[in-house]
Structure formats: structure tokens, C-alpha cells
């Protein structure tokens, strides 16, 4: 895959992932009422990072925001923070990657600067994706723990003791936002990796084209029974040359001795 394609695809994948992270963060269905093996209620409860909602049989839905900061569980605060970090890093990553795109020319920005920016945006996307994945996973772990705790309470006799009135505990399971978050985080991460790979293609590299830019003429090749030795530009007498993508020549290239291109 060409550098431009890899970089472009990485950008698009990261962009989709970033949009998904925003969507997941805003969604109300992080946890939804578990309907399996539960008395069927005429109301359906679901919760997000910012508010909880109840949908009645008529379709009427009432949502209430968490208007407290101190009263919320530390885990929920941590998940919020991780998702926001993911979004912030994603925004910065997108802004940086726009300028880093090979297909966009901005002033006299050379490829080494673009390579650095591509790497930076790639790293930002990777961290953004990881942040979202960790956030969603922490929330999922919290749900699993609470689910089994409430299940234990249900079946340990706490519900109905000796003919007393039963209280049904609402159990919550994974909501759609968790799956959106995992996929989005993964896409952002993949996009970031692709950006980093593209950066390698943009980076000026000493050994990119030296194997095909020979400086030895036919006279310098000595055939011996034990094999042959050709001076191919890797000898100690050869000065380091910088050869950029596209085969642009340096001043040293102009001083090659016998002929311009004298291949073995």
C-alpha cells in the first residue's frame, strides 16, 4: 500500500472511530435493564454516563441528569474522564493529521515535518482509542460486578423472607453504547497504528534506495574463483547520502566517478 493511501485510510478510520467515541460518550444506553429471567416490568430502565432514563409501555421516556458530582461513584467519574480524554486527544489528533496529510500542501512544509506530524497524530489516535477502550471496559467490569451482586441478593433469600413482601432488584446488563465504544476505540487505535506505519514511509531513510543506486563501474568488479565482490556504495569510502522518496539526487550523486548510472 502506498504511503498516501495508508495515511489517508488511517485518517479516515481514526475519524470514524473518533465519531464513534463521541457517540458512545453521549449515548444513554451504557447499561440497560436485564430482561432475561426477570419478572417482566412495564417500564424499561437504562443509564448513560450523564443521565438515566425510564421508558414506559406507552413509549413515554423520561430522562434525569446526574446533577451531582460528589454523589456519583468514583468509577463512573473515572469512565467519564477516560472518555473525555479520548475525545480531546482525538480532536488534537484530527487537527494534527489534517496538516500531516500528504495530499494536502501547506506552504513549504517538507516531508520530514509531515512525517513527524503523522507520527504525532498516530500516537494521539492510539492513546485516544486505548483511553476509550479502557473507559468502556471499566464500566463493563462495574456492570458485571453489580450484576452478580444483585443476582446473589435475588437468590439468597433477601427478596422474600418468610412470606414477607418481595422487592425485585433491577439488574443491569451491557447497553449498546459499550459495543459502540469498544468498536470505536478499536477503530481509532487501528487508524493510529496506520498513521504510524505511514510515518515510516514518509521518514527520510538512509537505506531506502541505496541498493539500487550503484557507484561501481564494470572495471571495479573483480571476478575470483571464490565468488565476486562488487563495490556497491556500502564501502567505508562511500559518504552517507540522503535519498528521499521519489529518488531526488544530492550533490554527492553528481560526483559519481565513471558514469551517471553504471549498474553491475
Amino acid at each position: 500500500m502506498s504511503v498516501t493511501a495508508c495515511q489517508g485510510l488511517g485518517f479516515v478510520v481514526s475519524l470514524i472511530g473518533f465519531a464513534g467515541i463521541i457517540a458512545a460518550t453521549c449515548m444513554d444506553q451504557w447499561s440497560t435493564q436485564d430482561l432475561y429471567n426477570n419478572p417482566v416490568t412495564a417500564v424499561f430502565n437504562y443509564q448513560g454516563l450523564w443521565r438515566s432514563c425510564v421508558r414506559e409501555s406507552s413509549g413515554f421516556t423520561e430522562c434525569r441528569g446526574y446533577f451531582t458530582l460528589l454523589g456519583l461513584p468514583a468509577m463512573l467519574q473515572a469512565v467519564r474522564a477516560l472518555m473525555i480524554v479520548g475525545i480531546v486527544l482525538g480532536v488534537i489528533g484530527i487537527l494534527v493529521s489534517i496538516f500531516a496529510l500528504k495530499c494536502i500542501r501547506i506552504g513549504s512544509m517538507d516531508d520530514s515535518a509531515k512525517a513527524k506530524m503523522t507520527l504525532t497524530s498516530g500516537i494521539l489516535f492510539i492513546i485516544s482509542g486505548i483511553s476509550a477502550i479502557i473507559g468502556v471496559s471499566v464500566f463493563a467490569n462495574m456492570l458485571v460486578t453489580n450484576f452478580w451482586m444483585s443476582t446473589a441478593n435475588m437468590y439468597s433469600g433477601m427478596g422474600g423472607m418468610g412470606g414477607m413482601v418481595q422487592t425485585v432488584q433491577t439488574r443491569y446488563t451491557f447497553g449498546a453504547a459499550l459495543f459502540v465504544g469498544w468498536v470505536a476505540g478499536g477503530l481509532t487505535l487501528i487508524g493510529g497504528v496506520m498513521m504510524c506505519i505511514a510515518c515510516r514511509g514518509l521518514t527520510p531513510d538512509d537505506s531506502n534506495f541505496k541498493a539500487v543506486s550503484y557507484h561501481a563501474s564494470g572495471q571495479n568488479v573483480a571476478y575470483r574463483p571464490g565468488g565476486f565482490k562488487a563495490s556497491t556504495g556500502f564501502g567505508s569510502n562511500t559518504r552517507n547520502k540522503k535519498i528521499y522518496d521519489g529518488g531526488a539526487r544530492t550533490e554527492d550523486d553528481e560526483q559519481s566517478h565513471p558514469t551517471k548510472y553504471d549498474y553491475v
Epitope: 417500564v43 409501555s57 425485585v168 433491577t170
Partner: antibody, heavy 119, light 113 residues
Framework: EVRLQQSGPELVKPGASVKMSCKAS????????MHWVKQSHGKSLEWIGY????????RYNQKFTGKATLTVNKSSSTAYMELRSLTSEDSAVYYC????????????WGQGTSVTVSS | DIVMTQSPSSLTLTAGEKVTMSCKSS????????????LTWYQQKPGQPPKLLIY???TSESGVPDRFTGSGSGTDFTLTISSVQAEDLAIYYC?????????FGGGTKLEIK
């Protein structure tokens, strides 16, 4: 004004079927669920189930599964309930009631359809 | 199914008196998601269909006289008529609106002397 007009009384033989109607007016028919409730003579109320006229979704009280079938005709804003394999136990007044928007309520009721099962 | 138990089954009062009737459910009707109790009260006058009075245990339906008030939470609920009028002669039903199937209490018959 919300109005639910139910069909007239029915006198049927045991084992037969009956289909009653409930014509809604004064509101958008597809915006509210239509519930059906049974009231045996001098007894309390029993919820049979409801139908969502918008998507045809139905929820029955398990006790009435196989006994009652709920349908709607959106174009005429009419809900129907068919009762089959009738016995004397099915003799009652059957009400259609609109599901309220808030609180899982039944906010408007039809006048009722009396069903008498007798040989 | 959820069992709704109403008491007393009937009561006779004179106009102007205060009346309270009770309704108990076999399971809590309180939804933790919105802290609302899904209990509804209906009034059925002789020869008429039931009429919605109160939902969410304590919210009065529009057009219902303010002498009717609902209270309670979880499993124990009460309907209070602050000053009974002659037109309040009816059977009052409580309904579980939380669990399927929705279930009704046996009713409390209010008679006026």
C-alpha cells in the same frame, strides 16, 4: 374529545367465537396503545393485553393467550378482540381502554361489550 | 402474578366525612430508575366504565377533584377522599402498572348514607 365506541352485546353458544370492535375517535389512533380489560359480573377487573396500532406489537396476559386475539385496522381507527372456544367463564363485560401517555395508565375507556355465553 | 389486596371491601359514610382506603401489593411497585411507584387508582360508578383518578401513586389525572389524593410507596398505598360527596358513590380499584400482567385489586365499595 377522546371517544371509544364499542360494538353491541353478544349472546353466543359455548364453543363458539365472538369478535368485538372498538372504534376510536378524537385522537391519533396510532399514537396510543389499545388495551382490553375483562370484568366478570360483580367481580374485579382483569387485564387481557394490549396492541400497539403503530407497529402491530401485542402483549397478552398469559392467562388469555390462546383465548383472545387482538387486531387493529389503522385505516378505520378500529381495534378488535376475538374470543374463541367460549365457555360460561367467558361471560363478562369487555372494555377497550386507551393506554395513557404517562404512568402506564388506562386513561379513556369504552362503554363495554357484554358477552353472554349460554346454550 | 402480582397480587393486589384492597381493604376494606366496603365502607359506608355520610357526606362530608374523610375516607381512606388501603391497597397492598405482593411486590414493590417502586421503580428505582425514576423513583416512581407504578400504582394507579380507578373509580367505577354503577353502570359505567372505570375512570382514571390517580397514577404514579400520587399524581392526580387532570379534571379529578382535588379532594382525591393518593399516597404510599413500595407495597403500601392509600387513597384518601378528604370530604366525601354523594357523587363519589363508586367502587375504587387499585392497579399494579409495574409488572406484567397488570393486575387489579378486588375493589373498595364506597356507599353513602
Amino acid at each position: 374529545e377522546v371517544r371509544l365506541q364499542q360494538s353491541g352485546p353478544e349472546l353466543v353458544k359455548p364453543g363458539a367465537s365472538v369478535k368485538m370492535s372498538c372504534k376510536a375517535s378524537g385522537y391519533t389512533f396510532t399514537d396510543y396503545n389499545m388495551h382490553w380489560v375483562k370484568q366478570s359480573h360483580g367481580k374485579s377487573l382483569e387485564w387481557i393485553g394490549y396492541i400497539n396500532p403503530k407497529n402491530g406489537g401485542i402483549r397478552y396476559n398469559q392467562k388469555f393467550t390462546g383465548k383472545a386475539t387482538l387486531t387493529v385496522n389503522k385505516s378505520s381507527s378500529t381495534a378488535y378482540m376475538e374470543l374463541r372456544s367460549l365457555t360460561s367463564e367467558d361471560s363478562a363485560v369487555y372494555y377497550c381502554a386507551r393506554g395513557g401517555y404517562y404512568g402506564n395508565t388506562l386513561d379513556n375507556w369504552g362503554q363495554g361489550t357484554s358477552v353472554t355465553v349460554s346454550s | 402474578d402480582i397480587v393486589m389486596t384492597q381493604s376494606p371491601s366496603s365502607l359506608t359514610l355520610t357526606a362530608g366525612e374523610k375516607v381512606t382506603m388501603s391497597c397492598k401489593s405482593s411486590q414493590s411497585l417502586l421503580n428505582s430508575g425514576n423513583q416512581k411507584n407504578y400504582l394507579t387508582w380507578y373509580q367505577q360508578k354503577p353502570g359505567q366504565p372505570p375512570k382514571l383518578l390517580i397514577y404514579w401513586a400520587s399524581t392526580s389525572e387532570s379534571g379529578v377533584p382535588d379532594r382525591f389524593t393518593g399516597s404510599g410507596s413500595g407495597t403500601d398505598f392509600t387513597l384518601t377522599i378528604s370530604s366525601v360527596q354523594a357523587e363519589d358513590l363508586a367502587i375504587y380499584y387499585c392497579q399494579n402498572a409495574y409488572f406484567y400482567p397488570w393486575t387489579f385489586g378486588g375493589g373498595t365499595k364506597l356507599e353513602i348514607k
